[in-house]
Amino acid sequence: QLTTESMPFNVAEGKEVLLLVHNLPQQLFGYSWYKGERVDGNRQIVGYAIGTQQATPGPANSGRETIYPNASLLIQNVTQNDTGFYTLQVIKSDLVNEEATGQFHVYPELPKPSISSNNSNPVEDKDAVAFTCEPETQDTTYLWWINNQSLPVSPRLQLSNGNRTLTLLSVTRNDTGPYECEIQNPVSANRSDPVTLNVTYGPDTPTISPSDTYYRPGANLSLSCYAASNPPAQYSWLINGTFQQSTQELFIPNITVNNSGSYTCHANNSVTGCNRTTVKTIIVTELSPVVAKPQIKASKTTVTGDKDSVNLTCSTNDTGISIRWFFKNQSLPSSERMKLSQGNTTLSINPVKREDAGTYWCEVFNPISKNQSDPIMLNVNYNALPQENGLSPG
């Protein structure tokens, strides 16, 4: 059976296509090619007479067609108007004609696309943004990329207009991109330049650093405030409710106890109209802001119950501190047998009983800091009960 095949089937505009003919019968007078799905003299492209080896152009001939002795038809410099069906009619020497129809599709070489946006400065959690991939072309597939990744599945991302439009519902600061669109057809593909979103957000709750609360007199107080915000936040400081200055950093040299108080950082975003504040307490004191870890020692760690006594000592080099004792997470002393002395430095147990066995530790603290020792284990033994002498009471 007579058939035709387009090589290639999908043709780039400006290129060429060859309509190949298979199973061409023997004993032919000639053949004609027509544009369309049927033989129509008004749409004849070319005819070829085998006897004279002469090609005759038809009404639909554009000058870009070449017919070959094997009936194949070459069309050069194709346009999108060339897309469609082509019919070959073979005039056989028995006067019975055969026909075969083929087709091809011409696609344009796609241009570099661009992205247009209906809002390039959206506000976080408030605005939606619609990106549109330009230009609009027929028979084109539109693809989107965010951060060089294909679109994630998200209820906030919507595709419409044949995937040509990407809508971000309720943008967040993480939606900055970059965004790229890609257009594809069967013969070409092209990707846009990246586009980034300037998402307006914040300010978030400010953070004051450093995190220190306690300072010694004579030190320099340098506080910095930061709140995530776009555009960057405008900052101001208040001390104990009184405005101080409009800067991101607050510096007070050579502080005194009088500089203790509430330090408030105020962050403002003039675009979103939002404000956030954070309050930090600063304490200026001679006390050590950091208490060293105390050492705990025992006069003996294994004692005989109801007989021995034991002294536990908590040692520290810090001054202006207090000491407290703990046994099995309970504060001491817990019985009349336990006594504290030398400013709670020593814990004495006399006599030791079975219930005193276990873990002990001490904690040193001042108004601004505390630290606790490693635990120490006290073991309580009992001697075997004395044998009865067998004498009857007297």
Epitope: G30, A49, G51, T52, L95
Partner: antibody, heavy 121, light 111 residues
Framework: EVQLLESGGGLVQPGGSLRLSCAAS????????MSWVRQAPGKGLEWVSV????????YYADSVKGRLTISRDNSKNTLYLQMNSLRAEDTAVYYC??????????????WGQGTLVTVSS | QSVLTQPPSASGTPGQRVTISCSGS????????VSWYQQLPGTAPKLLIY???RRPSGVPDRFSGSKSGTSASLAISGLRSEDEADYYC???????????FGGGTKLTVLG
């Protein structure tokens, strides 16, 4: 069944005009080249003109060039011959004939019954 | 004066084989296909042979065509009385850009 039926012949004075028609049926008219062939009384056959299946290619015998015009209306399955400036030597039976080869191996496989054109004063 | 030359007449008896010649040039018979037509008295011509030697369906195989160089021949074997008619050869002529016929041969079946 293939049928070709000519009409429009008759008596006309020299210099006059006549339009012949050939109604085709029984085949796809638009797929075939068509010709007019004439035969003067008692004489042989003389080819007059041919028109391709789409009407894009037309040829005439030297003896009629400029006076006779061939045309076709594929929507009406009809072939025409417009005859102007008629002469006595145009007197003949005019046949329309079908070429099944689209002109690649010109031949006439079906003929009409003919219509007589007489040019006389 | 016809471009293709045929004998004005030919004859034969029933059952006989008769040949009618057609002579032309390289611009017609030499490079193009030849057809033969039969015209019975008072009727339109009928195609007998096309493409030099091919018979359309319905034409008896008593009719055959051949070609050599710039000449063509129609042979009728087993001649019958109903074969009495005028016979024309025809071909496309590249120099005229038109179809040309021979002057016709009148075949008479004797007896």
């Amino acid at each position: 069944e293939v049928q070709l039926l000519e009409s429009g012949g008759g008596l006309v004075q020299p210099g006059g005009s006549l339009r012949l028609s050939c109604a085709a049926s029984g085949f796809t008219f638009s797929n075939y080249a068509m010709s007019w062939v004439r035969q003067a009384p008692g004489k042989g056959l003389e080819w007059v003109s041919v028109i391709s299946h789409g009407g894009g290619s037309i040829y005439y015998a030297d003896s009629v060039k400029g006076r006779l015009t061939i045309s076709r209306d594929n929507s009406k399955n009809t072939l025409y011959l417009q005859m102007n400036s008629l002469r006595a030597e145009d007197t003949a039976v005019y046949y329309c004939a079908r070429d099944p080869t689209k002109g690649y191996a010109p031949t006439f496989d079906y003929w009409g019954q003919g219509t007589l054109v007489t040019v006389s004063s | 004066q016809s471009v293709l030359t045929q004998p004005p007449s030919a004859s034969g008896t029933p059952g006989q084989r008769v040949t009618i010649s057609c002579s032309g040039s390289s611009s017609n018979i030499g490079n193009n296909y030849v057809s033969w037509y039969q015209q019975l008295p008072g009727t339109a011509p009928k195609l007998l042979i096309y493409a030099d030697s091919r018979r359309p369906s319905g034409v008896p195989d008593r009719f055959s065509g051949s070609k050599s160089g710039t000449s063509a021949s129609l042979a009728i074997s087993g001649l019958r009385s109903e074969d009495e008619a005028d016979y024309y050869c025809g071909a496309w002529d590249a120099s005229y850009n038109g179809y040309v016929f021979g002057g016709g041969t009148k075949l008479t079946v004797l007896g």
